[in-house]
Amino acid sequence: RPSFSLVEDTTLEPEEPPTKYQISQPEVYVAAPGESLEVRCLLKDAAVISWTKDGVHLGPNNRTVLIGEYLQIKGATPRDSGLYACTASRTVDSETWYFMVNVTDAISSGDDEDDTDGAEDFVSENSNNKRAPYWTNTEKMEKRLHAVPAANTVKFRCPAGGNPMPTMRWLKNGKEFKQEHRIGGYKVRNQHWSLIMESVVPSDKGNYTCVVENEYGSINHTYHLDVVERSPHRPILQAGLPANASTVVGGDVEFVCKVYSDAQPHIQWIKHVEKNGSKYGPDGLPYLKVLKHSGINSSNAEVLALFNVTEADAGEYICKVSNYIGQANQSAWLTVLPKQQAPGREKEITASPDYLE
């Protein structure tokens, strides 16, 4: 069990595993066909850097140049699209940074980068107002990279609207996805806009695109599936986050915690609190309050936003992330200044990684 006491008004049970998983999304680099693209591997202290595309080792060729921490793609084509990764090998460990490359003609791509959720249009689907397909909630489709352990099941969904009601079809790696393309086939529920693949295996890795169309238009959205066979590691938190912050009384502040995890991570934002004037319980453990956690009703758990802060909000804020392998945590301090003082950056204070363990 975690070595801390929870304030009684907290409803979360920290030792329970998550029902929600959250993996920081890779950056997306967009290029038009024919353009050149240069990406820098954003990893520090890299003795040796290796590159992969869609899980396959990437070596230099006449269009791909690898120089130190830079990857250059000359004369990009749609076939260059995919999930890239650079891995920095060090003497004691290795670290991987993922990014997506999307080589597409933006005008005709039909993808949802700039789409809206359509909620503001108030168009009756039963009226004569004909409408091209649209995503009903683009926010929920922002997570494109999904890591699923082998032998489990994945469900991709692309809920959409339109008038007449659009149809949906699925592509794998840009080609029609046929039942015979995988052992056991797959299942589609058009009324739920979903594709289910049971008992995934490494050959299921790849890009899955839902294409939604009616006579007035077509849109598509691509998810990348990674089937995790390797032993997952405990969560990794981006160094320097959350960052210390200061604000005046009545101000707003935001802490960000970037999480990298193969297995489902459960994110908690925790603060030291006092109970009956004491910071510690009878067992000698500090009183902690869970301010936010990942769950089915939680918005982006990687961000903790505090509004209209008071002096009581000052203190240490801990981002604690756990998966079934282990946990990691980092903290930041919030300084609340009287209204007449201007805010400034605080000295960095890093929590011991074993703080909550």
């Epitope: 329970e16 595993p17 029902t19 529920r189 489902q264």
Partner: antibody, heavy 127, light 107 residues
């Protein structure tokens, strides 16, 4: 063929202990999980707890938390339910079930489904 | 805990009948709902997962529908082997919870 076989049930006095075993075969043991579900005589199903076989992480129903412990021996492809401080209301047939996750990429949750079940073993707590 | 309420608690039907069992969750569980069938003295068997997906090897006369809080299991044409108790189960919230069961008996 996937198979789960429970053993270890029997009669025990209130306050006593018992360890149930669930021997698994026919699937990659560490890829998924094992759940324990019980059914009191003439009653419905009650979820007891679950372990992820990759590392033995667990969670439990409130009614058994602190008294029951789920563990696994991957070298033997066997999961265990250690039951301590048993009470009369723990009397039931105990089933183990292979449990896998359905990862919903849209609403970002994992649904746990129990697809293969053992035959069950009866635990009677009585003085 | 999320409460699951099934109705009816029991029903009598004949071979060939269309049977519908409903399950209501006390809070939104999206489509995270499974249906199981259990015969006396036997272990439960998975029929439907994710509210509407037929599990491998389950006859197509079984179907599931619903999302949010209201779900339905339908047997389009009841067969002799279908006389059993049926349970719904949600697995979005902790702990996983079952409905109290619906017993389908021969009329």
């Amino acid at each position: 063929e996937v198979q789960l076989v429970e053993s270890g049930g029997g009669l025990v006095q209130p306050g006593g202990s018992l360890r149930l075993s669930c021997a698994a075969s026919g699937f990659p043991f560490t890829s998924t999980g094992i759940s324990w579900v019980r059914q009191a005589p003439g009653k419905g199903l009650e979820w007891v707890g679950r372990t992820h076989l990759g590392d033995g992480s667990t969670n439990y129903a409130d009614s058994v938390k602190g008294r029951f412990t789920i563990s696994a021996d991957t070298s033997k492809n066997t999961a265990y339910l250690q039951m301590n401080s048993l009470r009369a209301e723990d009397t039931a047939v105990y089933y183990c079930a292979r449990t896998y996750g359905i990862y919903d990429t849209y609403d970002m949750y994992t649904e746990y489904v129990m697809d293969y079940w053992g035959q069950g073993t009866l635990v009677t707590v009585s003085s | 805990d999320i409460q699951m309420t099934q109705s009816p608690s029991s029903l009598s039907a004949s071979v060939g009948d269309r049977v519908t069992i409903t399950c209501r969750a006390s809070q939104d569980v999206d489509t995270s709902l499974a249906w199981y069938k259990q015969k006396p003295g036997k272990a439960p068997k998975l029929l439907i997962y994710s509210a509407s997906f037929l599990y491998s090897g389950v006859p197509s006369r079984f179907s599931g529908s619903g999302s949010g809080t209201d779900f339905t299991l339908t047997i389009s044409s009841l067969q002799p082997e279908d006389f059993a108790t049926y349970y719904c189960q949600q697995s979005t919230g902790h702990p996983q919870t079952f409905g109290q069961g619906t017993k389908v008996e021969i009329k």
